[in-house]
């Protein structure tokens, strides 16, 4: 992968593809500039991920200008939320998470874009994962790692998002108990970021620790192959 973008500087509001280990290049927006005074985020931008509405701190080498890269990275992907992210970056690039709070760092100075009131049940929860980036050591994850049922991970299309209910007991699907109803039929959260402590993902139950692999590109392919083998086809669930 070319690292020619290593020295590129971004400004607030810039649209990018952001790369996190174990995840495809994801449509994102620069939300905050690096703050030299804060060691853990020096030279890192806070990025907002479209589709999942999570945030993470990433260095410039993991950021790729959107317009220049969309041919390369903007192809539909099986990860949940990715297709929605592609739509949002094109059609709704100023979207904010419900209940979003900016941190005290250099946040973007935008035209005052009114944001919706926090939705019940999805404005107060913290993200499930937080910590430093891949280069800085292990990711700290709030919840114990768990293998969720990944069958149906390919079913990313609207109209084909819910599993056939008898096959998936609620208890097994949502052991953490948080937002039980809302999360019942979810398969996986796509981009479980190092979520900033005071940011608020808008989706119920957002965040699951990214895989801790070393060779990320190979692992992505391996994971996709595994999903392909396990998951039923996207389009084979027309009736409940």
């Amino acid at each position: 992968m070319s690292r020619s973008n290593r020295q590129k500087e971004y400004k607030c509001g810039d649209l990018v593809f952001a790369k996190m280990k174990g995840y495809p290049h994801w449509p994102a927006r620069i939300d905050e500039m690096p703050e030299a005074a804060v060691k853990s985020t020096a030279n890192k931008y806070q990025v907002f991920f479209f589709g999942t509405h999570e945030t993470a701190f990433l260095g410039p080498k993991d950021l790729f200008p959107y317009e220049e890269s969309k041919e390369k990275f903007g192809k539909p992907n099986k990860r949940k939320g990715f297709s929605e992210g592609l739509w949002e970056i094109e059609n709704n690039p100023t979207v904010k998470a419900s209940g979003y709070q900016s941190s005290q760092k250099k946040s973007c100075v935008e035209e005052p874009e009114p944001e919706p009131e926090a939705a019940e049940g999805d404005g107060d929860k913290k993200g499930n994962a937080e910590g430093s980036s891949d280069e800085e050591g292990k990711l700290v994850i709030d919840e114990p790692a768990k293998e969720k049922n990944e069958k149906g991970a390919l079913k990313r299309r609207a109209g084909d998002l819910l599993e056939d209910s008898p096959k998936r007991p609620k208890e097994a699907e949502n052991p953490e108990g948080e937002e039980k109803e809302a999360a019942t039929l979810e398969v996986e959260r796509p981009l479980p970021m190092e979520v900033e402590k005071n940011s608020t993902p808008s989706e119920p139950g957002s965040g699951r620790g990214p895989p801790q692999e070393e060779e990320e590109e190979e692992d992505e392919e391996e994971e996709a192959t595994k999903e392909d083998a396990e998951a039923p086809g996207i389009r084979d669930h027309e009736s409940l």
Epitope: L162, T184, E203
Partner: antibody, heavy 120, light 106 residues
Framework: QITLKESGPTLVKPTQTLTLTCTFS??????????VAWIRQPPGKALEWLAT???????RYNPSLKSRLTITKDTSKNQVVLTMTNMDPVDTATYYC????????????WGQGTLVTVSS | DIQMTQTTSSLSASLGDRVTISCRAS??????LNWYQQKPDGTVKLLIY???RLHSGVPSRFSGSGSGTDYSLTISNLEPDDIATYYC????????FGGGTKLEIK
């Protein structure tokens, strides 16, 4: 700017086949992730989804009408065609087409609708 | 099929009011819910997608919430332009609309 426009007969007779065309601009149905849906609304009643076609020719139909519906696309003309067989007066409705993206974004852009009356 | 029920078919409110429109699904739809506005002239617009996300260009006085089977659309400061019929729609399993709630000014 995305626009969609429905066209077709305003009056059809019972038992006839209705053919409606959705002509759109501002997007292409050859683009991955894009779909077009048909929705109808009988006078004074609620919206009812009929059918969806995706960029890769995958189709979805309303189960209660599936046997009567066919949805096709002509990518080069930026058109989607819905045919509905064996029309009945209860099928009198305003028929809409709308653009949809493949994950979670709803019917983002709608046509103005075309009123079809089924009567002998 | 998943059924969507909007128990209130019509609603009267005053300008400036905070209005809430409810929608119930026949089963858990995991937040796969959109809200649409249909104006008296028949024009339909997407307002909110995925339960609480505001579609581009929609005023911030609109907000959505809910989980499981129960969802709601709130208009925080009713304006004359909000006179319309509002529909919920699930998209987890095919697509189904609610019966609509017609909003009128007192």
């Amino acid at each position: 700017q995305i626009t969609l426009k429905e066209s077709g007969p305003t009056l059809v007779k019972p038992t006839q086949t209705l053919t409606l065309t959705c002509t759109f601009s501002g997007f292409s149905l050859s683009t991955s992730g894009i779909g077009v849906a048909w929705i109808r609304q009988p006078p004074g009643k609620a919206l009812e989804w009929l059918a969806t076609i995706w960029w890769d020719d995958d189709n979805r139909y309303n189960p209660s009408l599936k046997s009567r519906l066919t949805i096709t696309k002509d990518t080069s003309k930026n058109q989607v065609v819905l045919t509905m067989t064996n029309m009945d007066p209860v099928d009198t409705a305003t028929y809409y087409c709308a653009q949809i993206y493949d994950y979670a974004v709803g019917f983002a852009y709608w046509g103005q609708g075309t009123l079809v009356t089924v009567s002998s | 099929d998943i059924q969507m029920t909007q128990t209130t078919s019509s609603l009267s409110a005053s300008l400036g009011d905070r209005v809430t429109i409810s929608c119930r699904a026949s089963q858990d739809i995991s937040n796969y819910l959109n809200w649409y506005q249909q104006k008296p002239d028949g024009t339909v617009k997407l307002l909110i997608y995925y339960t609480s996300r505001l579609h581009s260009g929609v005023p911030s006085r609109f907000s959505g919430s809910g989980s499981g089977t129960d969802y709601s659309l709130t208009i925080s400061n009713l304006e004359p332009d909000d006179i319309a019929t509002y529909y919920c729609q699930q998209y987890g399993k095919l697509w189904t609309f609610g019966g609509g709630t017609k909003l009128e000014i007192k």
